[in-house]
Interface confidence: low
């Protein structure tokens, strides 16, 4: 039996930010701002599952709902990567997969999703309120990150349905005729922002975590939307953290590690970027091993320190039969 929390990326900011302007005037503007900023942009979804048989075992699944080519996936816990989070695994389409304890198995699951199994006992063991984040670097969209965790009340012995939360799919929004509402909302939002400009700037309260708090949002959807939001990273407080950075980041490993892009959002056309036809190519056509977007990660030839491989002795799992998103 599993307890699941399916968390879409596009969520309003933390409720703690509501204190800035008050419920009545802030909720709608934030929703509209989220709509305005994210319309036509990709999404990242995160699903966290706790195995009932092993209470310290988690399965994290992340997917990218975008049209670009995935050039790197980073899974972290304790907050977003680069904002207090600790990296658990990095999946590179060409150079393979690297993971750190307590990650047990990271793999490409489909052409645009990955999964990571965590296990642990003792200091490095994850716990129910740990926040897990997945960051997808893609071309041409840039870097997208979403975070999720199990609901605080999760009972591993119960099979709970995924946490309901609306996903703002740009394509569906268009189909449902939200474009007009969006346009109106953006205009209305500008009007509200202008009104608030003339009031004294309120003090932002620290973000609070409550049972009602959304557990995920798009971290840094783009430089443009970051500039529009002007909201600093607000990581979810967790009482459960990795033991030490030393155990999570052993030294050594394959030489490609040093050459991985540190911030793919600012360099989506790096060596790990794939050009695709709908976007006018700037310069030469660039590709990395496999194309799937993303769709994949090659196994490095040798197992080095900190690098765990999971070869399938039967060959590609694709040969075994149908593979769907479980």
């Amino acid at each position: 039996m599993r307890t699941e929390a399916q968390v879409p990326a596009l969520q309003p900011p933390e409720p703690g930010l509501e204190g800035a302007m008050g419920h009545r005037t802030l909720v709608l503007p934030w929703v509209l701002l989220t709509l305005c900023v994210t319309a036509g942009t990709p999404e990242v979804w995160v699903q966290v599952r706790m195995e009932a048989t092993e209470l310290s075992s988690f399965t994290i699944r992340c997917g990218f709902l975008g049209s670009g080519s995935i050039s790197l996936v980073t899974v972290s816990w304790g907050g977003p990567n680069g904002a207090g989070g600790t990296t658990l695994a990095v999946l590179h389409p060409e150079r393979g997969i690297r993971q750190w304890a307590p990650a047990r198995q990271a793999r490409w699951e489909t052409q645009s999703s990955i999964s990571l199994i965590l296990e642990g006992s003792g200091a490095s063991s994850p716990c129910a309120n740990t926040t897990f984040c997945c960051k997808f670097a893609s071309f041409p969209e840039g870097s997208w990150e979403a975070c999720g965790s199990l609901p605080p009340s999760s009972d591993p012995g119960l099979s709970a349905p995924p946490t309901p939360a609306p996903i703002l799919r740009a394509d569906l929004a268009g189909i449902l005729g939200v474009s007009g509402v969006l346009l109106f909302g953006c205009v209305y939002l500008l009007h509200l922002l202008r009104r608030h400009k003339h009031r004294p700037a309120p003090r932002l309260q620290p973000s609070r975590t409550s049972p009602q708090a959304p557990r995920a949002r798009a971290w840094a959807p783009s430089q443009a939307s970051q500039a529009a939001l002007h909201v600093p990273y607000a990581t979810i407080n967790t009482s459960c953290r990795p033991a030490t950075l030393d155990t999570a980041h052993p030294h050594g490993g394959p030489s490609w590690w040093a050459s991985l892009p540190t911030h793919a959002a600012h360099r989506p056309q790096g060596p790990a970027a794939w050009a695709s036809t709908p976007i006018p190519a700037r310069g030469s056509f660039v590709s990395v091993e496999n194309g799937l977007y993303a769709q994949a990660g090659e196994r490095p030839p040798h197992t080095g320190p900190g690098l765990t491989l999971f070869p399938d002795p039967r060959g590609p799992r694709a040969m075994e039969g149908p593979l769907g998103v479980r």
Epitope: S67, Q111, S276, L292, A318, M319
Partner: antibody, heavy 123, light 106 residues
Framework: QIQLVQSGPDLKKPGETVKISCKAS????????MSWVKQAPGRGLKWMGW????????TFPDDFKGRFAFSLETSASTAYLQINNLKNEDSATYFC????????????????WGTGTTVTVSS | ENVLTQSPAIMSASLGEKVTLSCRAS?????MYWYQQKSDASPKLWIY???NLAPGVPARFSGSGSGNSYSLTISSVEGEDAATYYC?????????FGGGTKLEIK
Amino acid sequence: QIQLVQSGPDLKKPGETVKISCKASGYTFTTYGMSWVKQAPGRGLKWMGWINTYSGVSTFPDDFKGRFAFSLETSASTAYLQINNLKNEDSATYFCARLGMGSTTGAGYFDVWGTGTTVTVSS
Amino acid sequence: ENVLTQSPAIMSASLGEKVTLSCRASSSVNYMYWYQQKSDASPKLWIYYTSNLAPGVPARFSGSGSGNSYSLTISSVEGEDAATYYCQQFTSSPWTFGGGTKLEIK
């Protein structure tokens, strides 16, 4: 059993358009990318590009930009290759090939190949 | 583009003989993939990640190499091995195939 079954042979005149189908079965169609490979008579294999079956985004190498188009009919688990303004040099056998994602570590190889469709362009 | 050159273009071998097919890349690649194609048939994945045999491939086949030079070896050729073998790289776009080596059995 995983299969990619392609449409039958086609005879076309220069300037016409041909559309080749590739019907997938035995797996979840939108899980794996689909590539297309050209093999001219007595010649080797040439990669024509691939389409992400989830997003529908196509990627082409320079040699196949312009007259070539990939499309999907997801509900029918079918991928299509369309070649416009056919030229004599388009006479070849065209294969669809599944991009083998989803293995333990993922990969970019072509793990399942279609039956092949021979297109003959002649005036 | 990364040009893959296979040699020899045609190879004739006797049953039980050890055979090595070569594939050289104009630029270094991380892994090489091999496909087998018999006449009037579709290609089949034969070796992936340089040295891993695809399901159903006999153990007499092996793959090796790194950088610019890769090879496919058959320890003891059998009649059913008569086919054309293509190498392929995914390291850089466009993904390219070698010209193929046609293996004939005497």
